[in-house]
Amino acid sequence: IWELKKDVYVVELDWYPDAPGEMVVLTCDTPEEDGITWTLDQSSEVLGSGKTLTIQVKEFGDAGQYTCHKGGEVLSHSLLLLHKKEDGIWSTDILKDQKEPKNKTFLRCEAKNYSGRFTCWWLTTISTDLTFSVKSSRGSSDPQGVTCGAATLSAERVRGDNKEYEYSVECQEDSACPAAEESLPIEVMVDAVHKLKYENYTSSFFIRDIIKPDPPKNLQLKPLKNSRQVEVSWEYPDTWSTPHSYFSLTFCVQVQGKSKREKKDRVFTDKTSATVICRKNASISVRAQDRYYSSSWSEWASVPCS
Amino acid sequence: RNLPVATPDPGMFPCLHHSQNLLRAVSNMLQKARQTLEFYPCTSEEIDHEDITKDKTSTVEACLPLELTKNESCLNSRETSFITNGSCLASRKTSFMMALCLSSIYEDLKMYQVEFKTMNAKLLMDPKRQIFLDQNMLAVIDELMQALNFNSETVPQKSSLEEPDFYKTKIKLCILLHAFRIRAVTIDRVMSYLNAS
């Protein structure tokens, strides 16, 4: 058993049928010695008397808010949550496996640049009685500071019969140098509590590996005289790290017909312009990627050929 | 990525082309190592990230762009005299570089070159003959060092009398390649910045 926060405790249980559970001793936070009784949640049934209460915690029915009273007055509370260990592996009932980029990915994180700011998000089908708390650091043995905000509900989607809820959080490394070469990964830890169930999820990454630039901005077409060709131009996104000559991007320009089946023409360039043939009803799209370290491509920025 | 390769024009900052080749070569070598050594811990998540140049060179600090010198987090160990030698600068005037930058890059390359050669000698003794260092990568390191044209003492190749532990050597190769790729990215960024200055 360990303390999650003041008066909230997590009991770790080896979770299998007929398991013996864990013996827990609760102590009433009071100078009083006599006439103390204990109850669980809203029940008025007295579970025991005395300054300490010993319970055998086996199932969720044994978890909840234990309260000690004296003469009708509440003295203190202890909330017990359960953390299930199923065959040596902590349960992951609360969050959905996003399966991207690999199986057992519960937290996904992205950064728009090298400033040390990043966003993480996760999915769940649970709509109520759900709380999250996020902590982060650079490295784990001698952790350096990363400050995270509160997790917020950022999207709701319908998937088949289920509603899916997306939560996200923004974090910022306290003293980040965009040019630094990372040798210790960022660690992100999310505590999730659903009713009386506690779970924790972690992700470990280097900022360089989660970079995903914003799409190029100001995408424009300039027709070339007496030709089907157009000059496409664009600019670096505002959110990208500066100076751009140091934090350079590379670009992919794509001409896509109206039908998805039509052949796509693609050109790769390090410049912020390209000359392409503009077909009728086609659209031109441009996306960006760090020129030197191949992390994710940005989303496409698009304009119609017409 | 199979991108069209742009050939530099003769007036271009001489080292940019070499640094691009370096990054391409080390990335290819790392990819090859990860595939060949699939049963070894060779991915970024599995290895310890060690920098053999730590406390010996200060490339990131010495080569910091002017725009980032206002960022206190970037100024841990910054030294502040400006570069005037090294053939890569050609005749370009630049107030951005410090004396350490290009020589620091040269020292990095020299240290990695020694490590890789020592490691290759060990790998050649492996009866499994599982992996060797790409000669192209070693050649590209050499070319960039020549282009940098700094004179420094030759570092003798380390020789070891004891029987090599091939498992440890292959893990060390992965660690070295990951670290060298990160340094090659920094070198490429620096050369690109210098080229634009």
Epitope: W15, Y16, P17, D18, E86, D87, G88, K102, N103, K104 | -
Partner: antibody, heavy 115, light 112 residues
């Protein structure tokens, strides 16, 4: 004490269907994940499928994906394995088992796929 | 399709020490815990070892388990005639959990 009693096995022709049941008693069935495991005659153990305690997530071996469906009725304390498009290679003793560090197995039920 | 490899058979005379190996990889045995089962002919498997080296109550202390890196082993010290059975190791793969990974199985024969 914990008990898992299986039923529903038998002889079936290739391409046909069969449903296996596993009745649980002696524990809070709705709190625990459950597996199906099979063993072809003279061969080793092969995992078939898993279902979460609340039925929200199901996982299958590649060899049965799209043909077998694991389900549970927590009000009846029963686990099911619906097997469709049966093949000769599905011939095996099928076991249900609880998920956890200490597990309990059903007695097994024989499924023979033969024309 | 078995990724956990066991020797097909091992044998020993009563009282001898018999060991069965189970070889896996970094993503299974290297990352998760190992169980061992005993299966007597015509019966369901019986749990002998969980959590690499833990014995459930009722399992004789002549059975012991261990794990090192990407391999695990089961030792029977002072093998007895009633230990003649098939033995299976079981683990998970960190990417496909909760799918069970079983070893290929080892037939233990008690001679004489």
């Amino acid at each position: 004490q914990v008990q898992l009693v299986q039923s529903g096995g038998g002889v079936v022709q290739p391409g046909r269907s069969l449903r296996l049941s596993c009745a649980a008693s002696g524990f809070t069935f709705s709190s625990y994940g459950m597996h199906w495991v099979r063993q072809a005659p003279g061969k080793g153990l092969e995992w078939v499928a898993f279902i979460r305690y609340d039925g929200s997530n199901k996982y299958y071996a590649d060899s049965v994906k799209g043909r077998f469906t694991i389900s549970r009725d927590n009000s009846k304390n029963t686990l099911y394995l619906q097997m469709k498009s049966l093949r000769a290679e599905d011939t095996a003793v099928y076991y249900c088992k609880t998920h956890g560090s200490h597990d309990n197995w059903g007695q097994g039920t024989m499924v023979t796929v033969s024309s | 399709s078995y990724v956990l490899t066991q020797p097909p058979s091992v044998s020993g005379t009563p009282g001898q020490r018999v060991t069965i190996s189970c070889s896996g990889g970094r993503s299974n045995i290297g990352s998760t815990t190992v169980k061992w089962y005993q299966q007597l002919p015509g019966t369901a498997p019986k749990l002998l070892i969980y959590g690499n080296d833990q014995r459930p109550s009722g399992v004789p202390d002549r059975f012991s388990g261990s794990k090192s890196g990407t391999s695990a082993s089961l030792a029977i010290t002072g093998v007895q005639a009633e230990d003649e059975a098939d033995y299976y190791c079981q683990s998970y793969d960190r990417g496909t959990h909760p799918a069970l990974l079983f070893g290929t199985g080892t037939k233990v024969t008690v001679l004489g």
